[in-house]
Interface confidence: low
């Protein structure tokens, strides 16, 4: 018959012939041939492959470096890559997440709208009339005026998008 | 609604081939891996295979290795099983089930078979 | 492959009455990421499995607080602090950090 020109999926040409692709996990040791199959040997230790392959070397692991404020998030098998993340109060720099940068505080007067992740940072906003945050934080929100009326007193000071408004008791006329 | 239907079974000699078939609507099906899990009569469960939301990544337990092969078609929303040289012991109610996950700090995590369909019942008998 | 052995296999239990059942692997199912790679699934009388507890102690999505998961390695437990009638069936634990999945036995609650 016809040499093939081609092959099937997980297959590869070599010498006219198809082999079949080592399996994610595994790397090529030897071609097949007419009468043996292809050869194919597990990665080793911190080494992985995540493809049907014909690689002679399986890729290492990446190095979550603590240096750079890195951890492992997810541990790399024989078929998939180390997943870095960043520290705690730590984001990656880039989505690669090849170093990381600390989260960034929302200053008196913000609130955060959203808290930051492993790779994203805080995003903050200013606070809107009838709301306040009185600290430097990466986790508060704006935080509501207090209602005097509902605790039946009455505003002695005005709040401010960094303050609470200051409640006090009623004015009690003299009989 | 999210929903797994399962077809294909039936009574089937030893020795002879089905193919079981899980249609998927109510989500995004070429997001998921997917498993089929079978229950033999009065017995506990037992796991079969796993396919990658891909289809690139293919598992099978021992107990059907060579003989029953995991596929799916995503154009299609479906799930297959395609099962040849039945044995008797291959008799059981067949579900297939959604690998959940959940996506945390940009990163995918399991997050448990968490969608079953309701079975399709095979019996291997002469 | 991984064994997964469940205990006790029966469960007579008493509506309003707090339930344990335990499962064992036999190896650890803590991954270096910190979770345990342990479900429970509940198949009550005729129906499917349902997922009850994901990564050992997570409540999957409507899954009533009556149910809680717990343990770490190869030790785990599902907790039922009252019992109610529709909690009968057959429980599972099932390690999904490797392939095969496996389960254990299973634990069958009925109500005494």
């Known amino acids: 018959p016809e040499p093939p020109t081609a092959c099937r999926e997980k297959q590869y040409l070599i010498n006219s012939q198809c082999c079949s692709l080592c399996q994610p996990g595994q790397k090529l040791v030897s071609d097949c041939t007419e009468f043996t199959e292809t050869e194919c040997l597990p990665c080793g230790e911190s080494e992985f492959l995540d493809t049907w392959n014909r690689e002679t070397h399986c890729h290492q692991h990446k190095y979550c470096d603590p240096n750079l404020g890195l951890r492992v998030q997810q541990k790399g098998t024989s078929e998939t890559d180390t997943i870095c993340t960043c520290e705690e109060g730590w984001h990656c720099t880039s989505e690669a997440c090849e170093s990381c940068v600390l989260h960034r505080s929302c200053s008196p007067g913000f609130g955060v709208k959203q808290i930051a992740t492993g790779v994203s940072d805080t995003i903050c906003e200013p606070c809107p009339v009838g709301f306040f945050s009185n600290v430097s934080s990466a986790f508060e929100k704006c935080h509501p005026w207090t209602s005097c009326e509902t605790k039946d007193l009455v505003v002695q000071q005005a709040g401010t998008n960094k303050t609470d408004v200051v409640c006090g008791p009623q004015d009690r006329l003299r009989a | 609604q999210v929903q797994l239907v399962e077809s294909g079974g039936g009574v089937v000699q030893p020795g002879r081939s089905l193919r079981l078939s899980c249609a998927a609507s109510g989500f995004t099906f070429s997001s998921y891996g997917m498993h089929w899990v079978r229950q033999a009569p009065g017995k506990g469960l037992e796991w079969v295979a796993v396919i990658s939301k891909d289809g690139g990544n293919k598992y099978h337990a021992d107990s059907v290795k060579g003989r029953f092969t995991i596929s799916r078609d995503n154009s299609k929303n479906t799930l297959y099983l395609q099962m040849n040289s039945l044995r008797a012991e291959d008799t059981a109610v067949y579900y297939c089930?959604?690998?959940?996950?959940?996506?945390?700090?940009?990163?995918?995590?399991?997050?448990?078979?968490?969608?079953w369909g309701q079975g399709t019942t095979v019996t291997v008998s002469s | 492959d991984i064994v997964m052995t469940q205990s006790p296999l029966s469960l007579p239990v008493t509506p309003g009455e707090p339930a344990s059942i335990s499962c064992r692997s036999s190896q650890s199912l803590l991954y270096s990421n910190g979770y345990n790679f342990l479900d429970w699934y509940l198949q009550k009388p005729g129906q499917s499995p349902q997922l009850l507890i994901y990564?050992?102690?997570n409540r999957a999505s409507g899954v009533p607080d009556r149910f809680s998961g717990s343990g770490s390695g190869t030790d785990f437990t599902l907790k039922i602090s009252r019992v109610e009638a529709e909690d009968v069936g057959v429980y599972y634990c099932m390690q999904a950090l490797q392939t095969p999945r496996t389960f254990g036995q299973g634990t069958k609650v009925e109500i005494k």
């Open positions: 089930a959604r690998r959940g996950h959940q996506l945390v700090l940009g990163y995918y995590y399991y997050n448990g078979l968490d969608v």
């Open positions: 990564l050992g102690s």
